[in-house]
């Protein structure tokens, strides 16, 4: 059974996470970014359930195309080089889905921009957090 | 179907610059990422690097950085690699190779390939 | 780097055999691994992709399956046209990495 400094410790790691997804959310937003045209082009793959850590692993498989689509944008809408942020959600993703458990992401038919992705991960993290506290 | 169709053999002196092309038809070129790998005889595969045609972003991998120049001609679809200084080890079959976002999770990996472009680098 | 070491060098078979080919991450991939086979002269082939999805237009008898940074090609049942050598890609970071090869021959 989790202990409360377990539960915790994922607490923080999804805040982080959901920080680092808003933060990117905001940066694609920006009404400066003369590349989100382009950027909204890009299919992302969603998954068909997400209510789990373990679901994170579809988000886990569609961080190499969210880099691809960060390194469109002005590196001035985000703290960070598009290749240290998203090596810093990997690291996080990983220790809230563990390495050993292969889950296979089923994803849904139909595909979704940046945005929507974004999003709906956002929510995904909402939920969790709203569910450990 | 998207083909891509590179150009011919070269034969070239140690020092001499190469440059290849590789021609996307059967789509836009704006909406692949152009990646180029080589195999030296009888070896294994190696990526050299890739461009992104619509900004004309570049990456390399760190043993070709600057004898590589990777570009990309949006007007004909073709992309180009250029090494320089060559040298009898560069001696192999390069291969254009692509990768897109815009469409099914399996064209993001190497999906469409150039039927290769064996250069030969001898004095 | 990431270094993909593929096992075995060479693999030789008859037809009809069960092959698995094997490739190891020097660190952690995810599922960012794809397969690819060569035959000579000819340029390689998309098999699987993201470690475990099969191309489209490739024979059910080719499957991928992943235990943590283990990576496994495995073709259930050998036809004469799948003599080649084949090869795993790591697309996780860049410089993407290809493994060694392993040559699959008619024993």
């Known amino acids: 059974a989790p202990t409360s400094s377990s539960t915790k410790k994922t607490q923080l790691q999804l805040e982080h996470l959901l920080l680092d997804l808003q933060m990117i959310l905001n940066g694609i937003n920006n009404y400066k970014n003369p590349k989100l045209t382009r950027m909204l082009t890009f299919k992302f793959y969603m998954p068909k359930k997400a209510t789990e850590l373990k679901h994170l692993q579809c988000l886990e498989e569609e961080l190499g195309p969210l880099e691809e689509v960060l390194n469109l944008a002005q590196s001035k809408n985000f703290h960070l080089r598009p290749r240290d942020l998203i090596s810093n959600i990997r690291v996080i993703v990983l220790e809230l889905k563990g390495s050993e458990t292969t889950f296979m992401c089923e994803y849904a038919d139909e595909t979704a921009t940046i945005v929507e992705f974004l999003n709906r991960w956002i929510t995904f993290c909402q939920s969790i957090i709203s569910t450990l506290t | 179907q998207v083909q891509l169709v590179q150009s011919g053999a070269e034969v070239k002196k140690p020092g001499a610059t190469v440059k290849i092309s590789c021609k996307v038809s059967?789509?836009?070129?704006?909406?692949?990422?152009m990646h180029w790998v080589r195999q030296a005889p009888g070896q294994g595969l190696e990526w050299i690097g890739r461009?992104?045609?619509?900004?004309?972003?570049?990456k390399y991998a760190e043993n070709f950085k600057g004898r590589v120049t990777i570009t990309a001609d949006t007007s004909t679809d073709t992309a180009y690699m250029e090494l320089s200084s060559l040298r009898s080890e560069d001696t192999a079959v390069y291969y254009c190779?692509?990768?897109?976002?815009?469409?099914?999770?399996?064209?993001?990996?190497?999906?469409?390939w150039g039927q290769g472009t064996l250069v030969t680098v001898s004095s | 780097d990431i270094v993909l070491t593929q096992s075995p060098a060479t693999l030789s078979l008859s037809p009809g055999e069960r092959a698995t080919l094997s490739c190891q991450a020097s660190?952690?991939?995810?599922?960012?691994l794809s397969w690819y086979q060569q035959k000579p002269g000819q340029a390689p082939r998309l098999l699987i992709y993201s470690a475990t999805s099969l191309a489209s237009g490739i024979p059910a008898r080719f499957s991928g399956s992943r235990s943590g940074t283990d990576f496994t090609l495995t073709i259930s049942s050998l036809e004469p046209e799948d003599f080649a050598v084949y090869y795993c890609l790591q697309h996780y970071s860049t410089p993407y990495t290809f493994g060694q090869g392993t040559k699959l021959e008619i024993k």
């Open positions: 660190q952690y991939i995810g599922n960012y």
């Open positions: 190779t692509t990768v897109t976002f815009l469409y099914s999770r399996e064209l993001r990996w190497f999906a469409y």
């Open positions: 461009i992104d045609p619509e900004d004309d972003s570049t």
């Open positions: 059967g789509d836009t070129i704006t909406a692949y990422y």
